[in-house]
Interface confidence: low
């Protein structure tokens, strides 16, 4: 049994059509409005799951539902990356995957979704209310981040309802990078709105039906609840964060690491060789265990699905926390 908390993606509002029958000319404007509102605001979903074992392990899954190509995914805990959060893993579609204790088995599930396993227990395990965040950098949308956590009262083995506490945040790059193609449409929309301002405008209503998924995903998290914006990040006790994450990476990482955009330049502690393979197909994901990687050519771990606990030695920094008895 497992405890789950899902943060479903925010679904774009569907224009209400009531009262619009006699105003067919408003259909296009409202379609444009929807596009203008949702353009550049791709959806990100986060699912946090805790396995019910003494040596509890957490599985974090994140997906990007935008239309752009993903250039980097950063997973952190304790808050957003760069805002008090600690980087757990960075996944690059071509450069490979890098992870830091207690992260394990970070991998691509599809070209737009990833999963990550955290080993944990004892002093090094994540607390039940730990916030996990996934940040997707894509072109042309920019960077988008969503966060999720287990319900505070979750007990291993008890099913928990989805947590409607996502945080979607567009970096400046995302805001500025919004496709300019719709600019004209937005201007035109404003023009039409001014022309029709004497007419009643249909209300925008949140969809209460099954949300539309912009893209297919390997598995679809239930959309049991609409996610709300601007939910404050949960704070976590320092005791819930592995001390191994407090040490700066002494080597500086691979050469390409330094050339990453600043939003991804938060260097996690502990080294791990980067796999230089392109996005592997399902079933052959390159995983950089917490730190056991030696030279890139020495560890061929192609990971499949599976859970791992904190202290799984994974390469150069496999020092996750131990499996302490709770």
């Amino acid at each position: 049994m497992r405890t789950e908390a899902q943060v479903p993606a925010l679904q774009p509002p569907e224009p209400g059509l009531e009262g619009a029958m006699g105003h067919r000319t408003l259909v296009l404007p409202w379609v444009l409005l929807t596009l203008c509102v949702t353009a550049g605001t791709p959806e990100v979903w986060v699912q946090v799951r805790m396995e019910a074992t003494e040596l509890s392990s957490f599985t974090i899954r994140c997906g990007f539902l935008g239309s752009g190509s993903i250039s980097l995914v950063t997973v952190s805990w304790g808050g957003p990356n760069g805002a008090g959060g600690t980087t757990l893993a960075v996944l690059h579609p071509e450069r490979g995957i890098r992870q830091w204790a207690p992260a394990r088995q970070a991998r691509w599930e599809t070209q737009s979704s990833i999963s990550l396993i955290l080993e944990g227990s004892g002093a090094s395990s994540p607390c039940a209310n730990t916030t996990f965040c996934c940040k997707f950098a894509s072109f042309p949308e920019g960077s988008w981040e969503a966060c999720g956590s287990l319900p505070p009262s979750s007990d291993p083995g008890l099913s928990a309802p989805p947590t409607p506490a996502p945080i979607l945040r567009a970096d400046l790059a995302g805001i500025l990078g919004v496709s300019g193609v719709l600019l004209f449409g937005c201007v035109y929309l404003l023009h039409l709105l001014r022309r029709h301002k004497h007419r009643p405008a249909p209300r925008l209503q949140p969809s209460r039906t099954s949300p539309q998924a912009p893209r297919a995903r390997a598995w679809a998290p239930s959309q049991a609840s609409q996610a709300a914006l601007h939910v404050p990040y949960a704070t976590i006790n320092t005791s819930c964060r592995p001390a191994t994450l407090d040490t700066a990476h002494p080597h500086g990482g691979p050469s390409w690491w330094a050339s990453l955009p600043t939003h991804a330049a938060h260097r996690p502690q502990g080294p791990a060789a980067w796999a230089s393979t392109p996005i592997p197909a399902r079933g052959s994901f390159v995983s950089v265990e917490n730190g056991l990687y030696a030279q890139a050519g020495e560890r061929p771990p192609h990971t499949g699905p599976g859970l791992t606990l904190f202290p799984d030695p994974r390469g150069p920094r496999a020092m996750e926390g131990p499996l302490g008895v709770r």
């Epitope: 002494p250 502990g270 917490n290 056991l292 799984d312 150069p316 920094r317 996750e320």
Partner: antibody
Framework: QVQLKESGPGLVAPSQSLSITCTVS????????VNWIRQPPGKGLEWLGV???????DYNSALKSRLSISKDNSKSQVFLKMNSLQTDDTARYFC????????WGQGTAVTVSS | NIVMTQSPKSMSMSVGERVTLNCTAS??????VSWYQQKPEQSPKLLIY???NRYTGVPDRFTGSGSATDFTLTISSVQAEDLGDYHC?????????FGSGTKLEIE
Amino acid sequence: QVQLKESGPGLVAPSQSLSITCTVSGFSLIGHGVNWIRQPPGKGLEWLGVIWGDGNTDYNSALKSRLSISKDNSKSQVFLKMNSLQTDDTARYFCAVNSAMDYWGQGTAVTVSS
Amino acid sequence: NIVMTQSPKSMSMSVGERVTLNCTASENVASFVSWYQQKPEQSPKLLIYGTSNRYTGVPDRFTGSGSATDFTLTISSVQAEDLGDYHCGQSYNYPFTFGSGTKLEIE
């Protein structure tokens, strides 16, 4: 309660193979990596390799050509196989869970002798 | 391979004394160092992980410190039951390596 228990042949003839099983309880092999470590009599510890929850393995490069680690998640067992044993492979072999090696088995003594 | 060098090789202390064990890594291992206690005829037990994190159930007289290449395990007031071998190990890079151990005897 987390427990690991190694079981092996005890005595192995030179050039023969060694097979040891580590049976675990209290946690799932799907979620944790298991390391193999050995300790020659009166000496220090030597890390042999690890098998991760996802089945991936990493080995000590000095022994990689002779080592093989596998597991059966359903039986909660991890297997170590080492080929071409020599007398200097005589040691107590331990399995331990996680990279920090939080829990260790009691070890199984292996003597390589003709 | 990263070489972990422990000192001293052995030491004899009286109950109540402060004990300091040292471990030096041949290269930077960040904070990925653990300390293990191995009593005679027993398997090692994790005491400290991540340089300074006391493992579950470990008495607070055991303290770990250090960074990069130099690490220390301190027993603030050694007890008779603390006798045995103490190993340091690094899980920063493959292969994981251990020090040769320090034997602690209680007078």
